[in-house]
Structure formats: C-alpha cells, structure tokens
Interface confidence: low
C-alpha cells in the first residue's frame, strides 16, 4: 500500500471549503478499507482530533465541530480517500493526516500529510488621530483591524488627486501608522487607510483638521 | 458586484417598532462600515449611525439614541435596522449605505447605497 | 458639531451652467466634503470628493461636467452643459467624530 505525495499545504478563505486530497494505491480488493483522517490544530498542537473515520464499510463522524460539514468526495471505498470540509472556520486551521490500512495490503507508507491554513480578510479597520491637530505639531494617525490572516498590511492615502502623503509625513505599514510632522493647514484632509492581505481589502477614513491659532486681542 | 438589497416597504402604527433589512452581497461584509441614513418626505438627508459588522459595535446619532438598534448576521451578510415607539413624523424612506472604498485612488471611489424601504406610521 | 449650509433651490437653463454652494461653519472650514446626487425616486450616488483646497476627484462613470472648487469655507459644484437629467436634488456631506453629516440639499431645475 501507498499513499501518494500530497500538494503539502492548502490555503482556503474562511467559509469556503477546502477539498484535503489523499489518494493510494494498493494490491488487495478494497474489502477491508479502513481510513482515519485526523488533524492537529494549530490553535491547540497538544490535542489531535478525529475528523472523519471509515471502517467497516461505515462512515463515522469526528469531533463534534466537524460534524455536518466533512464527508469523503467520492463515494467509498475508493483508493481516492479525499475529504472536504465545508464552511471552514479559523479554528480548521492544523496539519491534517490520512492514515489508510487495506488488509492484507501492510508494508509502505500509509499515512499523507496536509496543511490547511483558512485565510481570513481584514475587518473594518479602526481610524484614530493621536496628538494635537493645532499648526506646528505632531500627530499619528493610527489604523489597525482585529481580524486578518495573513496579518494585513495598511497603507495611508490622502484623498485628494496626488494620493500622495504630505512630505512631512512617515508611514508604517506594518504598524498601521503614519507621522505628519509640524502640520500645516495644507495636512488637513481626509486620510484613508486601506488595510488588506493576501484574500481581501478594508478600508476606514478620517479627516484631519489643523487648527489654526486664534489671534489674539491686545488689551 | 456590490450590492445592498433592502426589506419591503413597512405600515406602522404610532408606538410600534419597525426592523429593516439590508443584504449584502458582491463584497466582504465585515469589512466595511454599514450606515443608515433617512429620508422623510420631501426633506433633506439625515444620518442615524453605523454599525461595525465585523465586531457588531455601534455608533448612534444622538437624536436616535435610546429609540434604533443597529444589529447584524454575519453569517447571512445582513445588516438590520430597528426604530421603537415610531411617531408620525418617523415617516420616511430609509437607506442603509455601505462605508466608501477609495483603495487605489478617489476616482474608483463609490459608496453603495441599498434600494430604500418606506416606512409608514399612520394611525 | 459642524453645520453645512445650503442655498435650499436653484435653477438654469438646458446647455448653461450652474454653481451650487455649499458653506462649513466656523472651524470646520478645513474639511474635505462629498457631492452627492439625488435624483427623484432614486438613492442618492456619490459624485465627487472635494479637498479644502479646491483638489477633486470625480466618482467613477461621473462626466466630467461636473466640477469642484473650493474657497475658505464654500464648497462648489459646478454643472456645465445642463442636461435634463441633472434636475435632482444636491447634497454636500462631510465625516466627523465618526459620524456622517449632510447639508439640507439644493433642488436644482433644469428650464
């Protein structure tokens, strides 16, 4: 029995679902197929789940949070032993294995390997100012979005027909902030900040307004 | 593409409450703000606030304060919108409008805004 | 809390042009607004994002008969060229403190 080399890692967007191949080749009928399909979560590396099992010519459900949303893509026994998982969560996220026995078929390599990793897009980022907005001084524009993986990056724009930061201005896009040194009436405007990863786009806005300094009575 | 599909029209009486609808679809839903704006007839424009559908927080006009409830269903795409103890003057249509997306320049800017839902409070 | 003011009609004839206003309140004057149009029974369509420094971009799809400029606390939308279905209603609108805040409109007619 052998079980065939699997594309190593799968990347799937959060509630799509994700097809986990295993296929094998064997020289006994496939009477006594038996197939296990376990998974070690990222989020928990210490705690292997059972994901679906096939024994006896019966299918089994795994761990609860699976259930109803695995099967095997084709109708078994079959040598192609694949599995879907529907509406994939963040929590699906592991190594999956497929351990594949077929008395009297022993010997070679029964087990194929997995990644899955669900991609999830940025939420609505947070736009916030840090700092005074009077003439003359500094201020951080701050952006950050709770949810994304891979992590986002944020870009900073000012809306206008440049697109283009104030020359005073320094960004971090990994951060999601941006320094505009000595603000001048010409930094007012209305900022967006686009926050985005491999699978998907945010984006939040804010105006900034220098205040200029009120003039003075002489008295 | 984008698209923001709203609930029926509604007929109310005074001191009822009334839930509007908002589906949307052609985009991420939890990554955009979603506002609801009315309009009573033959009047101007009028923001009532935002929700955030990724983490449900809101953000209510102070007019409205204490009378709407912005909620949502992530796993439907829909944003919802409810008014309690409605007065006549409640009369209007009302929009729900997605946060705007300039990524990549203000010239592919746009701003969906659903189809609007009349809603009717009359004795 | 910022007010934008708007002259509540206006009216031009078909072909000319026509300059909508729109005024910040005291210390709002820096901001940047956005010009919407309504037209009847429709909902309103974003037309332009206009800069305190008069800077615009149109929306996409939106003719370039439509303008923006800006000076100290007015706004502009300049029509060119009117066509009939310019007739709607026009709103300036700008963001703060989170929020979304609308002039009352102009009705404009086309004669």
């Known amino acids: 029995l052998e079980v065939s080399e699997s594309p190593g890692s799968i990347q799937v967007a959060r509630g799509q679902p994700a097809v986990l191949p295993c296929t094998f080749t064997t020289s006994a009928a496939l009477i006594n197929l038996n197939v296990i399909w376990m998974v070690t979560p990222l989020s928990n590396a210490n705690q292997p789940e059972q994901v679906i099992l096939y024994q006896g010519g019966q299918m089994f459900d795994g761990a609860p949070r699976f259930h109803g949303r695995v099967g095997f893509t084709g109708t078994m026994p079959a040598t192609n032993v694949s599995i879907f998982i529907n509406n994939t969560q963040l929590s699906d996220t592991g190594t999956y294995q497929c351990l594949v026995n077929n008395l009297p078929d022993i010997g070679g390599r029964n087990i194929g390997v997995t990644g899955l990793t669900v991609l999830v897009p940025p939420s609505a980022p947070h736009c916030q100012i840090q700092g005074s907005q009077d003439i003359g001084s500094d201020v951080i524009l701050l952006c950050s979005s709770e949810e994304g993986i891979p992590r986002p990056t944020y870009l900073w724009e000012k809306l206008d027909n440049t697109l283009k930061l104030p020359p005073t201005a320094t960004q971090d896009q990994v951060q999601g902030t941006v320094t505009i040194r000595n603000i001048s009436a010409l930094s007012s405007g209305l900022y967006q900040c686009v926050a985005s990863n491999a699978i998907g786009t945010s984006t939040c806005l804010l105006d900034l307004q220098v205040i200029s300094p009120q003039p003075r009575n002489i008295g | 593409q984008v698209q923001l599909v709203q609930s029926g029209a509604e007929v109310k009486k005074p001191g009822a409450s009334v839930k509007v609808s908002c589906k949307a679809s052609g985009y991420t839903f939890t990554g955009y703000y979603m506002h609801w704006v009315r309009q009573a007839p033959g009047q101007g424009l009028e923001w009532m606030g935002w929700?955030?559908?990724?983490?449900?927080?809101?953000n209510y006009a102070q007019k409205f304060q204490g009378r709407v409830t912005m909620t949502r269903d992530t796993s439907i795409s829909t944003a919802y919108m409810e008014l309690s103890r409605l007065r006549s003057d409640d009369t209007a249509v009302y929009y729900c409008?997605?946060?705007?997306?300039?990524?990549?320049?203000?010239?592919?800017?746009?701003?969906?805004w659903g189809q609007g839902t009349l809603v009717t409070v009359s004795s | 809390q910022p007010v934008l003011t708007q002259s509540p009609s206006a009216s031009a004839s078909l072909g000319a042009s026509v300059k909508l206003t729109c005024t910040l309140s005291?210390?709002?004057?820096?901001?940047?607004i956005a010009w919407r149009q309504q037209q009847p029974g429709k909902a309103p369509r974003y037309l332009m994002l206009l800069n305190s420094d008069g800077s615009h971009t149109r929306g996409g799809g939106i003719p370039d008969r439509f303008s923006g400029s800006s000076s100290g606390a007015e706004r502009y939308l300049t029509i060119s060229s009117l066509q009939s279905e310019d007739e709607a209603d026009y709103y300036c609108?700008?963001?703060?403190?989170?929020?979304?805040?609308f002039g009352g409109g102009t009705k404009l007619a086309v004669l």
């Open positions: 409008a997605r946060d705007p997306d300039g990524s990549g320049g203000s010239s592919r800017w746009f701003d969906p």
């Open positions: 005291s210390g709002h004057t820096n901001y940047a």
């Open positions: 929700i955030n559908p990724n983490s449900g927080g809101t």
């Open positions: 609108m700008i963001w703060h403190n989170n929020a979304w805040v």
